[in-house]
């Protein structure tokens, strides 16, 4: 046999599909390695071929598509379970080949388990709704050609176990759920099942979505610098430990690269000749507003020190503050002895 | 001082996966730093692949988001970059570097490592 | 994506010549720009943060100026160590991009 470029096992498409559902998966080589598509390749007389590594297996063996009801099937470049059994669990292959050319890449397929509640090992997608931001929907992923546009299907969906019916801000309206008015208490698993018929059976697609209720970029601001500020004075005397918080509020913005940074004369800390060490804590509110807080510490301040600029500054894709931290070297108190005697004329 | 050294294979298949692995000495990446992957193809520019903060909050180029993972390793003081499904076009020079928050650029670089993408 | 470019792309210069590199941004970047050395095989080193801010250890014959969308980068006595490449780089918005370099010879 002629060689044949071997594109190897594609980690990239890690596919889990439900047992005892129908699934149908492409052929990853027309849509990410090769530079034409299936018609064109069947037009110019290659044939594409199916195999599979069983679970736990090395041995390449072909696809049985000759299984009672055509329980496994290839249309054009996709490969049909209808429905999956938990044994098709493994490495499946498909192969464009003719007499001089030969291309093929390998894909993991996981058959999973689900529980009457929708529980299972499958990475649920998250979907991100913002607060009280007005009417929001999620729509049932991945069902798209399993049924011709002719058939209707029947959509129920349900949050966690319970099926949803009469939620006050929650409406199914068939692939889509809407959210009227999405609250923190709407965070969870949403799933849709999705039922039709073929060929007089009937199918189920079962797809979840964890839902993410975050804040509402209406609400959110610029970033807010609590401290320091103008009502706390770091007053040290040389030798003592300078410890000055930064904590800034953040609001939460989708993809934002939040900051805080702090600058000593105008420049990073890194660059000043002093001992000088920065350790940030992270909090987040339930709706995913951030809180950071930077604690600048300088373990013996000297004199010198306590004349320089620290200024905190922080960043969001809503804007740029920054606030400078009001540092003073502290006036001993008078040694009475000495300096209080003297002003009483004591010799 | 803080040093930065890559390690990995020189030479990945294509479609393969291209792991990178960058170890910390001289200070910890539990500290609040970018850790940054940069790459160079041979001859040409810089391109800035992606960024994993301390707490481990991730921003990636768009033009390799579908393909690229980093991620750190708090008890080996590392980070690492995955990249899957590689072509000849990510052949290049892969350095990691350290970038502080806000304006203040990449401080501390990895002395960079090639990585080939042949079969 | 903000495009960065670098004028020239190649300069030729002697030592002890006062070089400007110029960079431009495709749109405002505020300050958020560092410059970058870079020598064959080698991996890039700032030279300059915050569009103007010298980074700890780098000769002070190396300025930056600019804010918005154009930024300088000279070199007020160039020294043999400094025929090298250099890049901008725009740390404002992501992608954070680099500009295409500018390579500077000796004449």
């Known amino acids: 046999s002629e060689r044949c470029d071997d594109w190897g096992l594609d980690t990239m498409r890690q596919i889990q599909v439900f047992e005892d559902e129908p699934a149908r998966i492409k052929c990853p080589l027309f849509e990410h390695f090769l530079k034409f598509n299936y018609s064109t390749a069947h037009s110019a007389g290659l044939t594409l071929i199916w195999y599979w590594t069983r679970q736990d297996r090395d041995l390449e063996e072909p696809i049985n598509f000759r299984l009672p009801e055509n329980r496994i099937s290839k249309e054009k470049d996709v490969l049909w379970f209808r429905p999956t059994l938990l044994n098709d669990t493994g490495n499946y292959t498909c192969m464009l080949r003719n007499t001089t050319y030969c291309s093929k890449v390998a894909f993991p397929l996981e058959v999973v388990q689900k529980d009457s509640c929708f529980n299972s090992p499958m990475k649920l997608p998250v979907h991100k709704l913002y607060i009280e931001y007005g009417i929001q929907r999620i729509t049932c992923p991945n069902v798209d050609g399993y049924f011709p546009s002719s058939v209707k299907p029947t959509i129920t969906w349900y949050m966690g176990c319970y099926k949803i019916q009469n939620f006050n801000n929650v409406i199914p309206e068939g692939m889509n759920l809407s959210f009227l008015i999405a609250l923190i208490s709407n965070n969870g698993n949403y799933t849709c099942v999705v039922t039709y018929p073929e060929n007089g059976r009937t199918f189920h697609l079962t797809r979840t979505l964890t839902v993410k209720v975050v804040g509402s970029p209406k609400n959110a601001v610029p970033p807010v610098i609590h401290s320091p500020n103008d009502h706390v004075v770091y007053e040290k005397e040389p030798g003592e430990e300078l410890l000055i918080p930064c904590t800034v509020y953040f609001s939460f913005l989708m993809d934002s690269r939040n900051e805080v940074w702090w600058t000593i004369d105008g420049k990073k800390p890194d660059d000043i000749t002093i001992d000088v060490t920065i350790n940030e804590s992270i909090s987040h509110s339930r709706t995913e507003d951030e809180t950071r807080t930077q604690i600048l510490s300088i373990k013996k301040v000297t004199s010198e020190d306590l004349k320089r600029s620290y200024v905190c500054h922080a960043r969001s894709a809503k804007g740029e503050v920054a606030k400078a931290a009001k540092v003073k070297q502290k006036v001993p108190a008078p040694r009475y002895t000495v300096e209080l005697a003297c002003g009483f004329g004591a010799t | 001082q803080v040093q930065l050294q890559e390690s990995g294979p020189g030479l990945v298949k294509p479609l393969g996966t291209l792991s990178l692995t960058c170890a910390v000495s001289?200070?910890?990446?539990?500290?609040?730093?970018?850790w940054s992957w940069v790459r160079q193809p041979p001859g040409k520019g810089l391109e800035w692949i992606g960024e994993?903060?301390?707490?481990?909050?991730?921003n990636y180029n768009p033009s390799l988001k579908s393909r690229v993972t980093i991620a750190l390793d708090w008890s080996k003081n590392q980070f690492s970059l995955q990249l899957r499904s590689v072509t000849a076009a990510d052949t290049a020079v892969y350095y990691c570097?350290?970038?502080?928050?806000?304006?203040?650029?990449?401080?501390?670089w990895g002395q960079g490592t090639l990585v080939t993408v042949s079969s | 994506d903000i495009q960065l470019t670098q004028s020239p792309s190649f300069l030729s210069a002697s030592v002890g010549d006062r070089v400007t590199i110029s960079c431009r941004a495709s749109?405002?970047?505020?300050?958020?720009l560092a410059w970058y050395q870079q020598k064959p095989g080698k991996a890039p080193k700032l030279l300059i943060y915050?569009?103007?801010t010298l980074q700890g250890g780098v000769p002070s014959r190396f300025s930056g100026s600019g804010s918005g969308t154009t930024f300088t980068l000279t070199i007020s006595s160039l020294q043999p160590e400094d025929f090298a490449t250099y890049y901008c780089?725009?740390?404002?918005?992501?992608?954070?991009?680099f500009g295409p370099g500018t390579k500077l010879e000796i004449k």
């Open positions: 915050a569009a103007s």
């Open positions: 570097a350290r970038y502080g928050s806000g304006p203040f650029g990449g401080d501390y």
């Open positions: 749109q405002g970047i505020s300050s958020y």
């Open positions: 994993i903060y301390h707490s481990g909050s991730t």
């Open positions: 001289g200070g910890s990446i539990s500290n609040s730093n970018w």
């Open positions: 780089q725009q740390l404002n918005t992501y992608p954070f991009t």
